[in-house]
Interface confidence: low
């Protein structure tokens, strides 16, 4: 449906404090650099503009696209060429290549300081004094860090934060009500945010059919009483959803998901029994809910797949008549069946469902050729499972620390030329996954533990991408979406690789190591370990455990001495030493 | 994009027929079981009839069976629902829907019996 004014048609559906929100969000992900006060000025501007549009839809330039608008008012930025450099140019182009520009110049990791959390007294001040202006401080840190974060979903986020704030700074104890709302907030966001990285890159750089493929296996799951017609008409709407807000069609993405969510809350009885309880919700808190809700249970009489997929005289037929509905129709049916599966592993078996068709529907007897077709799928079920139990096998004997440190070890020794903070982040991110997922029952693991593994290792392949340094890395994240993981696992040792040049400075540590909070010193040690495994690629696990060990033990003793410093200093000249002596540098 | 669109509703007196009809496109209808379903006002949906892929198999729920009567023709790629004999309890909106399942993924055609 055409309106008049597309700026005054979402102004008019998504009110004006969300408006702004998304606004601001959408200009703090495509200017990473520029400042609070420039961003909040050009938001200012679009919202007085929106609004005279909602006046008279025929005002001047009211007709002009959110683009067209949007990418003016970010081009009036006077620093642009010195802060952004080549980004400058986009600004020569006109729609759509401008926002495609813009979009490319998105930054995964940019160079911006580590949010450091104030007191709780002068956070709770703030907030009192201009509780406005404090939100929007929020949304802007958290979309210039995270430039693909699901805009809607941050402002649910930022919702929290204000409640957060609003309850605990009138509690007697404010420091012990806020910090556990925060910490929960900040790691719930990171997830949400790689979450979504993974689904933008998804539709970027795999395409479209990709992205409702791995959605049909996802929603299949998570409602198998629901028609297939009810499903692909699902799909549909999630993917235009997600390609709006990948594309940076913040405003276009927040209305979509708002009415998703209506349609799917009025047609309940056809989705889902589940959805009751998130249906009673407001609007932002309905929308989370539905994206996170608890798979339906599965219908108790479906019948066996063979006899549509494989006993069929006419799957040939059939296939060739249609083949991405029969395909859909497969994993549709594949994936309600199989809530113990993860997503990837149900579309690696639509994919060898595919490529048998291929074959054989070509073939002289096509159903001779195509009749053991599932036996080809034990093998790819059995794989991730061999490897979840081994692995949370490793995690319960090690614990997450060490269960971390063992990845990092078999990360770098896979592609050592990846830089140390992206191999610590990474290796740490995927140790996580023994927490997150081997307390489950066997049939919650899979589904948990390489779905998460796919979100992180997007996290290493979007940042590999930016500065590429290993061909290896490369090769896994772009030949196959839903191979990349088993493709990582198959690695072995780089024999190609030259250990890095002895440095000393790398291992010299100081006091300040002795204030940090444990995470942060478990990061020291981790990127000392890295850097370890860099030198010496060949170091056996008890030679790195020990020299692993003697360092804890240097940190230990010299954050207990009364002469930090010269401990340290001291101390670790022999660390170092001692280091090189059992490693053989 | 799957399609199902049903038709052949209507007002009808207790004791009269409707057949309903509905037009599938947009997947290989000649590969899957198909089902009716209906829904009263202010009640949830209710399995009425299912047909497999080739239509030598039909079933029936306990409340219509020797009054309807379920039939498909693969080639026009529609499925049909003869309904005989009709009483109150039938009006209701009805949906085709894909494999056998009391969820529906299309708009319904509305039939009522009354007098």
């Known amino acids: 449906d055409a309106h008049k004014s597309e700026v005054a048609h979402r102004f008019k559906d998504l009110g004006e404090e969300n408006f702004k929100a998304l606004v601001l969000i959408a200009f703090a992900q495509y200017l990473q650099q520029c400042p609070f006060e420039d961003h909040v000025k050009l938001v200012n501007e679009v919202t007085e503009f929106a609004k005279t549009c909602v006046a008279d839809e025929s005002a001047e330039n009211c007709d002009k696209s959110l683009h067209t608008l949007f990418g003016d008012k970010l081009c009036t930025v006077a620093t642009l060429r010195e802060t952004y450099g080549e980004m400058a140019d986009c600004c020569a182009k006109q729609e759509p290549e401008r926002n495609e520009c813009f979009l490319q110049h998105k930054d995964d990791n940019p160079n911006l300081p580590r949010l450091v959390r104030p007191e709780v007294d002068v956070m709770c001040t703030a907030f009192h004094d201009n509780e406005e202006t404090f939100l929007k401080k929020y949304l802007y840190e958290i979309a210039r860090r995270h430039p693909y974060f699901y805009a809607p979903e941050l402002l649910f986020f930022a919702k929290r934060y204000k409640a957060a704030f609003t309850e605990c700074c009138q509690a007697a104890d404010k420091a012990a009500c806020l910090l556990p709302k925060l910490d929960e907030l900040r790691d719930e966001g990171k997830a949400s945010s790689a979450k979504q990285r993974l689904k933008c890159a998804s539709l970027q750089k795999f395409g479209e059919r990709a992205f409702k493929a791995w959605a049909v296996a996802r929603l299949s799951q998570r409602f198998p009483k629901a028609e297939f017609a009810e499903v692909s008409k699902l799909v549909t709407d999630l993917t235009k959803v997600h390609t709006e807000c990948c594309h940076g069609d913040l405003l276009e993405c927040a209305d979509d998901r708002a009415d998703l969510a209506k349609y799917i809350c009025e047609n309940q009885d056809s989705i889902s029994s589940k959805l009751k309880e998130c249906c009673e919700k407001p609007l932002l808190e309905k929308s989370h809910c539905i994206a996170e809700v608890e798979n339906d249970e599965m219908p108790a009489d479906l019948p066996s797949l063979a006899a549509d997929f494989v006993e069929s005289k006419d799957v040939c037929k059939n296939y060739a008549e249609a083949k991405d509905v029969f395909l859909g129709m497969f994993l549709y049916e594949y994936a309600r069946r199989h809530p113990d599966y993860s997503v990837v592993l149900l579309l690696r078996l639509a994919k060898t469902y595919e490529t048998t068709l291929e074959k054989c529907c070509a073939a002289a007897d096509p159903h001779e050729c195509y009749a053991k077709v599932f036996d080809e799928f034990k093998p790819l079920v059995e794989e991730p499972q061999n490897l979840i139990k081994q692995n949370c096998e490793l995690f319960e004997q090690l614990g997450e620390y060490k269960f971390q440190n063992a990845l990092l070890v078999r990360y770098t020794k896979k592609v050592p030329q990846v830089s140390t903070p992206t191999l610590v982040e990474v290796s740490r991110n995927l140790g996580k996954v023994g927490s997150k997922c081997c307390k489950h029952p066997e049939a919650k693991r899979m589904p948990c533990a390489e779905d998460y593994l796919s979100v992180v290792l997007n996290q290493l392949c979007v940042l590999h991408e930016k500065t590429p340094v290993s061909d290896r890395v490369t090769k896994c994240c772009t030949e196959s979406l839903v191979n990349r993981r088993p493709c990582f696992s198959a690695l072995e040792v780089d024999e190609t690789y030259v250990p890095k040049e002895f440095n000393a400075e790398t291992f010299t540590f100081h006091a300040d190591i002795c204030t940090l909070s444990e995470k942060e010193r478990q990061i020291k040690k981790q990127t000392a370990l890295v850097e370890l495994v860099k030198h010496k690629p060949k170091a056996t696990k008890e030679q790195l455990k020990a020299v692993m060990d003697d360092f804890a033990a240097f940190v230990e003793k010299c954050c207990k001495a009364d002469d930090k410093e010269t401990c340290f200093a001291e101390e670790g000249k022999k660390l170092v030493a001692a280091s090189q002596a059992a490693l053989g540098l | 994009e799957v399609q199902l669109v049903e038709s052949g509703g209507g007002l009808v007196q207790p004791g009269g027929s409707l057949r309903l009809s509905c037009a599938a496109s947009?997947?290989?209808?000649?590969?899957?079981?198909m089902s009716w379903v209906r829904q009263a006002p202010g009640k949830g949906p209710e399995w009425v009839s299912a047909i497999d892929s080739g239509g030598a198999d039909t079933r029936y729920a306990e409340s219509v069976k020797g009054r309807f009567t379920i039939s498909r023709d693969n080639a026009k790629k529609t499925l049909y629902l003869q309904m005989n004999n009709l009483k109150p309890e039938d009006t209701a909106m009805y949906y085709c829907?894909?494999?056998?399942?009391?969820?529906?993924g299309s708009q319904g055609t509305q039939v009522t019996v009354s007098s």
């Open positions: 947009g997947f290989t209808f000649g590969s899957f079981g």
């Open positions: 829907t894909i494999g056998r399942s009391t969820s529906r």
